[in-house]
């Protein structure tokens, strides 16, 4: 099965990764 | 028009195999961090794992349910993502969504595991 | 792991009027480059989820400006100043600060 699904545009976007931190580390365990 | 087209979805018996791909159009994919995420009917969100770019020397990371069994891959020449995976349990039954750093989303491919 | 709470579970909502929805994370979300990686997604009835803010309270290109966000460390709101009959979804929170990534367990919004 395949879908799409996109947000229009007029060229080549980028996606941005900016919701996600750089270099993660696992979290703590408390 | 960003566009993340994804496949492979299917019927698969537990112990089985399966290999889901996400082929991006509009974006500029090597940039891109890609992550699988999935939702088992009626629930809510899993993050399954994630690849890196070029850059991040294409590391990748993976939810502890499925590490071992899972493995994420892209190929930046083809604007493709994937997700392989193996020794599939009935409770990895969900729909598979591939996203851009939970940017861009595909509409989902849906994975059923059932005997 | 962290844990990602949400409130309320579900909420109804008359057209034009505020709506909030709390996240709360089970550890810090500031991240050592001062950044705190707290995301907000909606996923209308039938369609995939779609990223509101990211960064706590930046907004997504596109995105209406009666959506906002705020909050900090561990205690964030989303809060939409007058809301629309296209609003209606589950309302996830996400946190991106340390792995694995989790999410909230949503909040369902609909109209009265």
């Known amino acids: 099965s395949e879908t799409t699904t996109g947000t229009s545009s007029n060229s080549s976007q980028s996606t941005s990764n900016s919701g996600l931190a750089p270099n993660p580390t696992n979290a703590t365990t408390k | 028009e960003v566009q993340f087209v994804e496949s492979g979805g299917g019927l698969v018996q537990p112990g089985g195999s399966l290999k889901l791909s996400c082929a991006a159009s509009g974006v500029t994919f090597s940039e891109a961090w890609m992550d699988w995420v999935r939702q088992a009917s009626g629930k809510g969100l899993e993050w399954v794992g994630e690849i890196r770019d070029k850059p991040n020397s294409y590391v990748t990371y993976y939810a502890e349910s499925v590490k071992g069994r899972f493995t994420i891959s892209r190929d930046d020449s083809k604007n493709t993502a994937y997700l392989q995976m193996n020794s599939l349990k009935t409770e990895d039954t969900a729909v598979y969504y591939c996203?851009?750093?939970?940017?861009?989303w595909g509409q989902g491919t849906l994975v059923t595991v059932s005997s | 792991d962290i844990v990602m709470t949400q409130t309320p579970l579900s909420l109804s909502v008359t057209i034009g009027q505020p709506a909030s929805i709390s996240c709360k994370s089970s550890?810090?979300?500031?991240?050592?480059?001062?950044?705190?990686?707290l995301n907000w997604l909606l996923q209308k009835p039938g369609q995939s989820p779609k990223r509101l803010i990211y960064q706590v309270s930046k907004l997504d290109p596109g995105i209406p400006d009666r959506f906002s966000g705020s909050g900090s460390e561990t205690d964030f709101t989303l809060k939409i100043s007058r809301v629309e009959a296209e609003d209606v979804g589950i309302y996830y929170c996400m946190q991106g600060s340390s792995l694995p990534w989790t999410f909230g367990g949503g909040t369902k919004v609909e109209i009265k």
């Open positions: 550890q810090s979300l500031l991240y050592s480059n001062g950044k705190t990686y």
């Open positions: 996203t851009g750093a939970m940017d861009y």
